[in-house]
């Protein structure tokens, strides 16, 4: 499955919006830094693992959407930027949905995807528990925003690589 060029542009727009959403200096939150253990191995790999990576990226965007859709998130960010961010994520989910649907029913891909989907889910569980532990403080949200930016950047580069291999 080939992702449309617009998908990559949407990804970049989402990254720009995430950057714009920053309200406080990252340096003032250094004490709150945390290693969430981004499951990079899920997104690495060869062409055979392309379906796995796309499926995992869909899960990542879906979990990001859910994370930023909570009432705690709404209180933390600028409403206009947040709404624009939702739109970009929604569009990306639509693009990826078509790709993942094509692979549904392929047995070896399904087995591979179990672990990759669970790895992404666990990553977001760590983020969720971190935010709760920090009582959704402004610095906690800033750390999470920066983390999501890093993971999006990584997967954007991955998708460029996948397109080149095609």
């Amino acid at each position: 499955c080939d992702l449309p060029q617009t998908h990559s542009l949407g990804n970049r727009r989402a990254l720009i919006l995430l950057a714009q959403m920053g309200r406080i200096s990252h340096f003032s939150c250094l004490k709150d830094r945390y290693d969430f253990g981004f499951p990079q191995e899920v997104f690495d790999g060869n062409q055979f693992q392309k379906a796995q990576a796309i499926s995992a990226f869909h899960e990542m965007i879906q979990q990001t959407f859910n994370l930023f859709s909570t009432k705690d998130s709404s209180a933390a960010w600028d409403e206009t930027l947040l709404d624009k961010f939702y739109i970009e994520l929604f569009q990306q989910l639509n693009d990826l949905e078509a790709c993942v649907t094509q692979e549904v029913g392929v047995e070896e891909i399904a087995l591979m995807n179990e672990d990759s989907i669970l790895a992404v889910r666990k990553y977001f569980q760590r983020i969720t528990l971190y935010l709760m532990g920090k009582k959704y403080s402004p610095c906690a949200w800033e750390v999470v925003r920066a983390e999501i930016m890093r993971s999006f950047s990584f997967s954007t580069n991955l998708q460029k690589g996948l397109r080149r291999k095609d």
């Epitope: 869909h58 993942v100 649907t101 549904v104 669970l118 569980q125 760590r126 969720t128 528990l129």
Partner: antibody
Amino acid sequence: QVQLQQPGAELVKPGASVKLSCKASGYTFTNYWMHWVKQRPGQGLEWIGEINPSHGRTIYNENFKSKATLTVDKSSITAFMQLSSLTSEDSAVYFCARGGLGPAWFAYWGQGTLVTVSA
Amino acid sequence: QIVLTQSPAIMSASPGEKVTLTCSAGSSVDSSYLYWYQQKPGSSPKLWIYSTSNLASGVPARFSGSGSGTSYSLTISSMEAEDAASYFCHQWSSYPFTFGSGTKLEIK
């Protein structure tokens, strides 16, 4: 508020199939995986599998792969589970439960459908 | 698959008594993915404790959870009549997700 509606009961004959439904409301249906869980009378809970309503990807417990088929209908925001070649061992209450994270994992359950397999 | 063994299968406690239910995993489970559910007859399970030690919304403070690796527990500091129910531990650390066989807690 989040709600998952399931019919109360289904009576089916041995060897037949049954399709159970779980109608969602109060949240964006396509954003959360839907899980199915089996409970035999007076017994524990068994995880059957899950489906992502967004793209239809399914993940099954190997023990139920030849028994259950999970599907969704996005237009009616409903998840389905078809159980085939029914025997008395399949008589149980079947719950749907919504995925999530942290305090949202399996925080929402349907009331359950009692399936009775009897001639 | 990870087998979760709960003990005892049935127990009864007097009001005010301290109660501890245990859940033993066949292989190690990350504490972030160990949950407890309460179920009363004729009802669906309710999320009770998530990630080993966090109480779900509305759960009384007399409940607590602890553990790591293969050994987990749910404790009630002072039993009350409304606590009579079945309690199931659950893991989603690895596929297939599994539940314990449950402990039925009765009031004396």
